[in-house]
Amino acid sequence: SGTTNTVAAYNLTWKSTNFKTILEWEPKPVNQVYTVQISTKSGDWKSKCFYTTDTECDLTDEIVKDVKQTYLARVFSYPAGNVESTGSAGEPLYENSPEFTPYLETNLGQPTIQSFEQVGTKVNVTVEDERTLVRRNNTFLSLRDVFGKDLIYTLYYWKSSSSGKKTAKTNTNEFLIDVDKGENYCFSVQAVIPSRTVNRKSTDSPVECMGQEKGEFREI
């Protein structure tokens, strides 16, 4: 039911990477507008994106308050120019989103190799600790701050002259690997959260190779 010419939103989908979280839905509005509400399972509803003609709403500011909570959102449909109008039951049309738990479900963004440094036959590879929009004591937390040891990185490395790859893991943001003297190597990293059952992996970082400007070589 609902007001004539007003259709309920559908295909409500959470799009979230490194906790930047947007709710998307359909359809593109024709003579109607939307308002979104979000709440935790036990909390009150908070309205966002009032009377918008967009079909997305950035809910990051709400979910970063507690990324381990489970959130539910709903999208209300109103006739354009008559937002006080309600459906036949006295309520505007709305549709619920799936539940969303940021800590378990946010996608891991593509990591970046910050630097690598060779000392003799060892190379130290450092992964950039990306800043998130999660705050604690007015400070933005990094991905490592949020996930702690739940977050691991897998390093893939190979001689520039061959395709055979090797791999190593760390639950910090640094790798220390053995390499052959006089050989140039290429590196790529992937973030993984082993405790998850879905969305466990990031895409691979861009490849960085020795002999390019990111690294530093020291013969000792």
């Epitope: 790859k165 993984v192 059952t197 466990r200 691979d204």
Partner: antibody, heavy 117, light 103 residues
Framework: QIQLVQSGGEVKKPGASVRVSCKAS????????VYWVRQSPGKGLEWIGY????????IYDQNFKGKATLTVDKSTSTAYMELSSLRSEDTAVYFC??????????WGQGTTVTVSS | DIQMTQSPASLSASVGRVTITCLAS??????LAWLQKPGKSPQLLIYA?????GVPSRFSGSGSGTDFSFISSLQPEDFATYYC?????????FGQGTKLEIK
């Protein structure tokens, strides 16, 4: 429930090739690497390599480079290992296993490959 | 490559407490798993050196860096071969195995 079901045993002649399959079910196939391990008669476990179905990256033990080729078919959630130029020393039980990054938590039932003239 | 040296190679015991050790040739932090192979497929017992994977609490693991131990208060069904495996860097090597036999 999570299962890895491997293809049946094979008897092959020296110099031939064999393909062993490992069909995964009960979990998101691309979220976990698939490892391959072998156990030769009277010996311990030997790591062959792994494939990441998410990005297609393969890592091999040096001893199995050129011997084993790992592939996946994401549409059927199946991992494959092809062994080429078989010799009697390749006679073994071959296992696939799911990698949870910190360990191998689910294993296939094993496939016996016998190489004999 | 990281070598894993497991000892003893075999152990005869009646029910009671047994300890198996695993020594890594270089530091692997806690990237170590213990597996039981009772004749068929291996089964994961312990991951990250100390964490039980849904197995009875009579099993335990300890250690980090290069020295690791696996302890079990044996039950009749525990007679099998046990392996440590490092999952820190490729190749992800196994120990040689410890065969636990009934005395």
């Amino acid at each position: 429930q999570i299962q890895l079901v491997q293809s049946g045993g094979e008897v092959k002649k020296p110099g031939a090739s064999v393909r062993v399959s490992c069909k995964a079910s009960g979990y998101s196939f691309t979220d976990y690497n698939v490892y391959w391990v072998r156990q030769s008669p009277g010996k311990g476990l030997e790591w062959i390599g792994y494939i990441d179905p998410y990005n297609g990256i393969t890592i091999y033990d040096q001893n199995f480079k050129g011997k084993a080729t790992l592939t996946v078919d994401k549409s059927t959630s199946t991992a494959y290992m092809e062994l080429s130029s078989l010799r009697s020393e390749d006679t073994a039980v071959y296992f696939c296993a799911r990698d949870v990054t910190t360990a191998l938590d689910f294993w296939g039932q094993g496939t016996t490959v016998t190489v004999s003239s | 490559d990281i070598q894993m040296t497991q000892s003893p190679a075999s152990l005869s015991a009646s029910v009671g407490r047994v300890t198996i050790t695993c020594l890594a040739s270089q530091t692997i932090d806690t990237w170590l798993a213990w597996l039981q192979k009772p004749g068929k497929s291996p089964q994961l017992l312990i991951y990250a050196a100390t964490n039980l994977d849904g197995v009875p609490s009579r099993f335990s693991g300890s250690g980090s860096g290069t020295d690791f131990s696996f302890i079990s208060s044996l039950q009749p069904e525990d007679f099998a071969t046990y392996y440590c495996q490092q999952v820190y860097s490729s190749p992800f090597t196994f120990g040689q195995g410890t065969k636990l036999e009934i005395k």
